[in-house]
């Protein structure tokens, strides 16, 4: 029978006797930076080439006994998870291994850097097809390791890394914290976060998604036909590296941004029990478990978007937080969130020729998050239209006035500390979907985009009585690009997108009272691209 | 011991070929920064990655490394260049005393310096 982990990542339509065709991932080369490996193990024989690269520190302790099978254990298992003939994800992928971890599973940042440089030089000397680099290791936050990962990613290499096994914020570790790297947390057969002794999988905004990482059957270095079960975020990352190899083999031209968006899009949503994570990390941690796409082609027509959270701004009066999209992505909307509710909104602004999302803390606030909605929108031309605070009681409004531009997101930002708590809510005049409306003391920012075949619509869900959370979702075939609250009153903690649902959070109802002030409306902007759909149909 | 002699020889050569003082002082207003692992047990003091500014060429990286060795030797410190980076990041890996960090941060082309640290199988 199929091991639980392979079944979990396999869409139902694939599930037959045989998990996958034997050549899945055959156009892709996966580099593994790990321990030494037993490359003649029957599970990986002929699939893994051991390079002559080795950069490891000496083992600790004078009494350490170097036993080959122990030295090879971690790397052999991971190579098997990626491409093993029986228990591998991408059975056709070829691999190259670099030894950067010693027999105790320990390496150095510098050794890893030299390994990444070796990969880049190999790529330049002999360009092959798509490359995936698996980094099943973690150390403390390292600026230089993150920078090297960024450079390699910008050279077209897909990097996949373990989130870390420290039951901690992945942003405190490298390469997990590098934005260009696909960072993977671990879940078990019950889709719960993996506990490892007193610790467990890392979590937080630096994790892109989770994947099976407990009781994973794979090649054992104890003998050439042995199998063993291992657990950890390394195993989870190996699954995603295998899935990435499968996807790149089917569509070799996929960019890193496209691959990441597809990984997120095809993941199982909302299956992880978030109670395992610390309360302050739940909203930041993606509730996604990786899976193979239901079919290798035909995803191109979709408008893909993902949510990117900033680091926390910190509590100072003028503190701000910035969320950025990847280079090939468009920022289609910007929202903000504060647990205390004390914030001064958010705005989209240009930084280095690219739009970023900046959130502003308020006096007495514990800090804010900026939340960017980052989308793949080819040939897009987006701009931000701003309306300063209006003096009229009707509130501030701004719309997309350029021909062919559609509204993809609304943001509001205010300088006053308290945004008119006692003023009645401002409601959007009906029949004006291309318009952002906000509080009269706030400046309003509309994200307006022109792209072939792009169409968007506004969807609202209002609740008259106070409620901690109001949601509105885009229907099938439409993608959530914008998420905001109407009105921008003080008891709203903020708004953010979770998959295709816009979530507006309010202060605890017990402290709000049930006046009209409690009314909250969640506003979603849902878009689709007819152009992408047509292009896809023509291909098929 | 052989290694150390080799290093010393290299240093003498570097001393002879290097002009005195800082020929290329760092650009005004840009200060290189020092980074180290926040998790103390994972730190590896004594080995440092010197990262140079983005457009630095390999020859400049080598020259900067040699300059560091020469200036360190003048102060009575032995250093060893373990690796010169190029292809991903310009810079070099150096084994040296932490006492030399202030000196190294003032070298031309230096963007930042990071103390080496451990990584672990997950």
């Amino acid at each position: 029978s199929i091991p639980w982990n392979l079944e979990r990542i396999t869409p139902p339509r694939y599930r037959a006797d045989e998990y996958q065709p034997p050549d899945g991932g055959s156009l892709v080369e996966v580099y593994l930076l790990d321990t030494s490996i037993q490359s003649d193990h029957r599970e990986i024989e002929g699939r893994v080439m051991v390079t002559d690269f080795e950069n490891v520190p000496e083992e600790d302790g004078t009494r350490f006994h170097r036993q080959a099978s122990k030295c090879d254990s971690h790397g052999t298992h991971l190579a098997g998870v990626v491409s093993g003939r029986d228990a591998g994800v991408a059975k056709g992928a070829s691999m190259r291994s670099l030894r950067v971890l010693n027999c105790q599973g320990k390496g150095t940042v510098s050794g890893t850097l030299i390994g990444l440089e070796f990969i880049r030089k190999s790529q330049l000397v002999q360009p092959v097809g798509p490359l995936v680099v698996l980094l099943p290791l973690a150390g403390g936050y390292s600026r230089v390791l993150n920078a090297a990962c960024q450079r390699l990613a910008r050279a077209g290499v897909v990097l996949v890394t373990a989130a870390g096994n420290f039951r901690d914020d992945a942003c405190l570790y490298s390469p997990a914290s590098a934005p260009e790297v696909i960072t993977v947390g671990a879940t078990n057969a019950q889709d719960q976060p993996v506990t490892l002794g007193t610790l467990g999988t890392n979590f937080g905004r630096c994790v892109d998604l989770f994947a099976p990482g407990e009781d994973i059957i794979g090649a054992s270095s104890d003998c050439s036909t042995c199998f063993v079960s291992q657990s950890g975020t390394s195993q989870a990352a190996a699954h995603v590296a295998g899935i990435a190899a499968m996807m790149l083999s089917a569509e070799p031209e996929l960019t890193l941004a496209e691959l990441r968006q597809r990984l997120i899009h095809f993941s199982a949503k909302d299956v992880i029990n978030e109670a395992w994570f610390p309360e302050d990390q739940r909203v930041l941690t993606p509730n996604l478990v990786a899976a193979l796409p239901p079919s290798t082609h035909g995803a191109g027509w979709q408008l893909f978007c993902r949510t990117v959270w900033s680091a926390h701004s910190g509590p100072t009066r003028m503190a701000t937080a910035v969320a950025r999209c990847a280079p090939d992505e468009e920022l289609l909307s910007c929202s903000s969130f504060s647990r205390s509710g004390k914030r001064r909104g958010e705005r989209m602004e240009a930084q280095g020729g690219k739009l970023v999302c900046r959130a502003h803390n308020a006096f007495g606030g514990e800090g804010v998050y900026a939340i960017a909605r980052c989308c793949l929108l080819p040939q897009a031309n987006c701009s931000v239209h701003t309306a300063p605070p209006a003096e009229a009681s009707m509130g501030t409004r701004v719309h997309c006035h350029q021909q062919g531009h559609v509204l993809t997101g609304c943001s509001s930002h205010w300088e006053v500390e308290d945004l008119g708590t006692h003023k009645p809510p401002v409601l959007r005049p009906r029949g004006q979907p291309n318009q952002c409306v906000g509080h009269r003391e706030a400046s309003i920012h509309a994200s307006c985009c022109h792209a072939p075949g792009l169409e968007c619509k506004v969807k609202e869900h209002g609740i008259p009585a106070p409620q901690e959370q109001v949601t509105v979702a885009c229907e099938e075939g439409w993608t959530l690009t914008g998420c905001s609250a109407l009105p921008g009153t003080s008891h709203v903690l903020g708004a953010y997108a979770v998959d295709n649902t816009c979530v507006v959070r309010s202060r605890d109802v017990s402290t709000t009272g049930s006046t009209s002030e409690g009314a909250v409306t969640a506003v979603a902007i849902c878009c689709r691209s007819r152009h992408l759909a047509q292009a896809s149909q023509e291909l098929q | 011991q052989e290694d150390e002699d080799g290093d010393y020889e290299e240093l003498v050569l570097a001393l002879r070929s290097e002009e005195d003082g800082l020929a290329e002082a760092p650009e005004h207003g840009t200060t290189a920064t020092f980074h180290r692992c926040a998790k103390d047990p994972w730190r590896l003091p004594g080995t440092y990655v010197v990262v140079l500014k983005e457009e630095t060429h390999l020859s400049q990286s080598e020259r900067t490394a040699r300059r560091l060795q020469a200036q360190a030797a003048r102060r009575g410190y032995l250093t060893k260049i373990l690796h010169v980076f190029h292809g991903l990041l310009p810079g070099f890996l150096v084994k040296m005393s932490g006492d030399l960090l202030e000196l190294a941060l003032k070298l031309p082309h230096v963007d930042y310096i990071e103390e080496d640290s451990s990584v672990f199988a997950q």
């Epitope: 024989e45 080439m49 050439s224 | -």
Partner: antibody
């Protein structure tokens, strides 16, 4: 190119031992072990076992346990198969092949056991 | 051990004929089946691995199919150099086991 070259034919008496060698070239030996397969005259193929260049690990067919020993010498890229206490039904052509996949074969070594 | 049964044990055919050889496993071997060609006095040569994959250098007239317990090797248009003995081999379990062979002779 990738090839396996075996030692020459052997004639042995019953009860004796034979050691057949197989020299690998043209590929990274550590990435594959060596399988040994034999074929008695006019018969089919029989897998005897596998040996690793990487760490010397072995995997023997049950029928061979105790009588056969497979070893490797990575320094010369050579694998060896020794068969002891030879019997007349050990008369066969002995082949080495690359790995469990057996995608490359040696030319074969004829071992004749006759009194 | 898994038993492999080939049929027919021999067949006569002419150049240009389409030839089919079947192989049955005593239990499911998924798609872990290889086919070898052996000419008199020569070592076997891998023709097909994993039921249907042709290694580079093997002519396209050779094809393999099947999964589970029943497998087929097809030579779409028999050539003079194809007269040989063909063996199937399961690669699912250790020890690997071979079929008894199918001899393809000139009619």
């Amino acid at each position: 190119q990738v090839q396996l070259v075996q030692s020459g034919a052997e004639v042995k008496k019953p009860g004796a031992s034979v050691k057949v060698s197989c020299k690998a070239s043209g590929y990274a030996i550590y990435n594959y072990g060596i399988s040994w397969v034999r074929q008695a005259p006019g018969q089919g193929l029989e897998w005897m076992g596998w040996v690793s260049f990487y760490n010397g690990n072995t995997n023997y067919a049950q029928k061979l346990q105790g009588r056969g020993t497979m070893t490797t010498d990575p320094s010369t890229s050579t694998a060896y198969m020794e068969l002891r206490s030879l019997r007349s039904d050990d008369t066969a052509v002995y082949y080495c092949a690359r790995g469990y996949v057996m995608d490359i074969w040696g030319q074969g070594t004829t071992v004749t056991v006759s009194s | 051990d898994i038993q492999m049964t080939q049929s027919p044990s021999s067949l006569s055919a002419s150049v240009g004929d389409r030839v089919t050889i079947t192989c049955r496993a005593s239990q499911s071997i998924n798609n872990w089946l290889d086919w070898y060609q052996q000419k008199p006095g020569k070592a076997p040569k891998l023709l097909i691995y994993a039921a249907s994959t042709r290694p580079s250098g093997v002519p396209s007239r050779f094809s393999g199919s099947g999964s589970g317990t029943d497998f087929t090797l097809t030579i779409s248009s028999l050539q003079p150099e194809d007269f040989a003995t063909y063996y199937c081999q399961q690669d699912q379990d250790i020890p690997p086991t071979f079929g008894q062979g199918t001899k393809v002779e000139i009619k």
